[in-house]
């Protein structure tokens, strides 16, 4: 059945922590991606920027859990409203933002 | 235009080794993910293993012992070399090429023929 | 590793009429609510082309007369209705742990 919203984020949260921690060369050779409005549908529009990296292993887990916590299809070069078009950071970065939102969110009890 | 073609000896004795070089055109090495794949004669296909673009590498089990794959991004190819090799190696070897997520075989070389045989 | 169990080895469809091809895992292909299994098909001659992908999704430019689906252990590839040009041996992959793996193959012939 579908994974309880707040397993889905502690699991997220230990996966993006699991990166930042073993990370040694740059995250994904230092691929750029879409920066994104951390707010409500936040799942499909992380997803929507990551899907548009590819051949990266430190974040297939990422990419998966994502595509399975959003409930509609993702493909690349799909863009939301949630996008900050005009700004491009590092995978690195990116997750590190991510992370931070998401521990936030956890404390707070929000988990949808 | 994203292109993969494959290059080998042909012919390999038997408890020789196996070198295949797999080169690509229309993408970068750095941020792709490629498979190598075996087809004997009049059989199904069998993964063996494959190289991601940030350099992590999978292996088949059963063969795990036997294979190693390593790539040059800057030469823009991709090596298979496989040991000990045995007549049931004898196959066609393909390259492919994975998509983006969730990283199916999206684009495939035309294959190499090897026959191992004395 | 998963193994993937495909029947039949083999079938002949008439023209127009509807294949259907199955796909069995020794484990759950499932991660995060996707299935992780996709379908290839492959001409004689030739190396293997993507059909579908995640068990259902059509892949670009292919017909819609194929169709996939299935969940956890038990997938199925439909081609319906068959045509001349889809005479062909038709795979099925997981990706679900990083050793992947093939199934046998299951060869399609046009009556």
């Known amino acids: 059945g579908p994974v309880p919203p707040s397993t889905a984020l502690r699991e997220l949260i230990e996966e993006l922590v699991n990166i930042t921690q073993n990370q040694k060369a740059p995250l994904c050779n230092g691929s750029m991606v879409w920066s994104i409005n951390l707010t409500a549908g936040m799942y499909c529009a992380a997803l929507e920027s990551l899907i548009n990296v590819s051949g990266c292993s430190a974040i297939e887990k990422t990419q998966r859990m994502l595509s399975g916590f959003c409930p509609h299809k993702v493909s690349a070069g799909q863009f939301s409203s949630l996008h900050v078009r005009d700004t491009k950071i590092e995978v690195a970065q990116f997750v590190k933002d991510l992370l931070l939102h998401l521990k936030k969110l956890f404390r707070e009890g929000q988990f949808n | 235009e994203v292109q993969l073609k494959e290059s080998g000896p042909g012919l390999v004795a038997p408890g020789g080794s196996l070198s295949i070089t797999c080169t690509v055109s229309?993408?970068?090495?750095?941020?792709?993910?490629i498979n190598w794949v075996r087809q004997p004669p009049g059989k199904g296909l069998e993964w063996l293993g494959m190289?991601?673009?940030?350099?992590?590498?999978d292996y088949a089990d059963a063969l795990k012992s036997r294979l190693s794959i390593s790539k040059d991004s800057s030469k823009s190819q991709v090596f298979l070399e496989m040991t000990s090799l045995r007549t049931d190696d004898t196959a066609t070897y393909y390259c492919a090429r994975d998509g983006r997520f969730p990283y199916a075989m999206k684009f495939w070389g035309q294959g190499t023929s090897v026959t191992v045989s004395s | 590793d998963i193994v993937l169990t495909q029947s039949p080895a083999s079938l002949a469809v008439s023209l127009g009429q509807r294949a259907t091809i199955s796909c069995r895992a020794s484990e759950s292909v499932d991660s995060y609510g996707q299935s992780y299994m996709h379908w290839y098909q492959q001409k004689a001659g030739q190396p293997p082309k993507l059909l579908i992908y995640l068990a259902s999704n059509l892949e670009s430019g292919v017909p819609a007369r194929f169709s996939g689906s299935g969940s956890r252990t038990d997938f199925t590839l439909t081609i319906d209705p068959v045509q001349a040009e889809d005479a062909a041996t038709y795979y099925c992959?997981?990706?679900?742990?990083?050793?992947?793996?093939f199934g046998g193959g299951t060869k399609l012939e046009i009556k």
């Open positions: 229309g993408f970068s090495l750095t941020d792709s993910s």
């Open positions: 992959q997981q990706n679900a742990e990083d050793s992947r793996t």
């Open positions: 190289i991601w673009g940030d350099g992590r590498i």
